[in-house]
Interface confidence: low
């Protein structure tokens, strides 16, 4: 079950979608992607305090065990729950091609 | 693409399946679960060095941006790629019931 979006640690500090601007050089794509020259990468960043956006039962278990054994069990982690597709114009031997990637940009985040 | 399982940090230090023994009390389940009294919780723990078990394109991007901006972009995180079901015998008003949870035990891990 997807849980609420209020962050008990303060605004913006918990798991949420962030946008990071990256050039093709930053991504190591300059030799095989023509366009876009710059990508607005949406990614999931932030803390996962107790039960915040817990993705499933496993995430809830992880929270409980992290409280008990913080050195052994890590806290849940902020990761994409779903993705937005993105089209890249790629270089090919014969010219260019349009390729859609379904798992490139995070659309929604949760803790797991 | 799922990448190789060789861990550059040393044996067992990268993202992999671990088993953590937990009682119903540890999990906060003692009041609603009858059995099992103890759960062998399989969870994903470990580091995600460059491209190790990268789940998808997003994970690869994250690795690249983490190298460039480690204070802004976290490294990929070790999370379940799939789950094993688990049956819990639960207390109910009228007695007990068997409930299968599909998202409780990690089966396989990757970095994202």
């Amino acid at each position: 079950a997807r849980n609420g979006d209020h962050c008990p640690l303060g605004p913006g500090r918990c798991c949420r979608l962030h946008t990071v601007r990256a050039s093709l050089e930053d991504l190591g794509w300059a030799d095989w992607v023509l366009s876009p020259r710059e990508v607005q990468v949406t990614m999931c960043i932030g803390a996962c305090p107790s039960q915040f956006r817990a993705a499933n039962m496993h995430a809830q278990i992880k929270t409980s065990l992290h409280r008990l054994k913080p050195d052994t069990v890590p806290a849940p982690c902020c990761v994409p729950a779903s993705y937005n597709p993105m089209v890249l114009i790629q270089k090919t031997d014969t010219g260019v091609s349009l390729q859609t990637y379904d798992d490139l940009l995070a659309k929604d985040c949760h803790c797991i | 693409a799922r990448n190789g399982d060789h861990c550059p940090l040393g044996p067992g230090r990268c993202c992999r399946l671990h088993t953590v023994r937990a009682s119903l009390e540890d999990l906060g389940w003692a009041d609603w679960v009858l059995s099992p009294r103890e759960v062998q919780v399989t969870m994903c723990i470990g580091a995600c060095p460059s491209q190790f078990r990268a789940a998808n394109m997003h994970a690869q991007i994250k690795t690249s941006l983490h190298r460039l901006k480690p204070d802004t972009v976290p490294a990929p995180c070790c999370v379940p790629a799939s789950y094993n079901p688990m049956v819990l015998i639960q207390k109910t008003d009228t007695g007990v019931s068997l409930q299968t949870y599909d998202d409780l035990l990690a089966k396989d891990c990757h970095c994202i």
Partner: antibody, heavy 117, light 110 residues
């Protein structure tokens, strides 16, 4: 602006029924658990129940006569077989974040239900 | 069901005083307890989540502590706007125990 507005309260005779509404704005109800709480005049707060993504749960005393439901933008509380002791201000509230813990972060102003013959 | 017992039910204090309100659960609820403030004619306002996490916008003079069965809300230096009624609420395993509130503590001007 995140807001909850209750309506549907009023004077009802014992044995009657009433459906209270809680209109949500500024956020998506589909992302949150919602609770109903009541407060009799001069008394303390009493939790009635909650609607989650997967269903509803109620205080022991509320099971049977109280039913919580929702649609895309409104949460409802149906009260049947009203008794004089149901006289109270009824609040709806949004759960802050959920899991094993369900604190109430956003509250409506409440709607008064008076049960009297 | 879990019962929540708050004490005292009322207290008189002056501006600047340190005020402590306690809440006791009839069985262990880990650290999943919330505190609320309510003023006459208004809905409650969340102060503290999970026993000690300050809700957004709540002044730092409010603090919470405790786990298991015994919990405390402390106002380090009472301000005029703090005169109100305070409630604790158990937020533990709602599907079995509900979310019961304590009976409330009315903080009045001495």
């Amino acid at each position: 602006e995140v807001q909850l507005v209750e309506s549907g309260g009023g004077l009802v005779k014992p044995g009657g029924s009433l459906r209270l509404s809680c209109a949500a704005s500024g956020f998506s109800l589909s992302n949150y658990y919602m609770s109903w709480v009541r407060q009799a005049p001069g008394k303390g707060l009493e939790w009635i129940g909650m609607i989650s993504f997967s269903g509803t749960t109620y205080a022991t005393w509320a099971k049977g006569r109280f039913t919580i439901s929702k649609d895309s933008s409104t949460v409802y509380l149906q009260i049947n077989s009203l008794k004089t002791e149901d006289t109270a201000v009824y609040f709806c509230a949004r759960v802050v974040y959920a899991g094993w813990t369900y604190p109430l972060g956003i509250w409506g102003q409440g709607t008064l239900v008076t049960v009297s013959s | 069901d879990i019962q929540m017992t708050q004490s005292p039910s009322s207290l008189s204090a002056s501006v600047g005083d340190r005020v402590t309100i306690t809440c006791q659960a009839s069985q262990s609820i880990s650290s999943v307890l919330s505190w609320y403030q309510q003023k006459p004619g208004k809905p409650p306002k969340a102060l503290i989540y999970e026993a000690s996490i300050l809700a957004s916008g709540v002044p730092s003079r409010f603090s919470g502590s405790g786990s298991g069965t015994d919990f405390t809300l402390t106002i380090s230096s009472l301000q005029p706007e703090d005169f109100a009624t305070y409630y604790c609420q158990a937020n533990y395993d709602v599907y079995n125990y509900g979310n019961p509130f304590g009976g409330g503590t009315k903080v009045e001007i001495k």
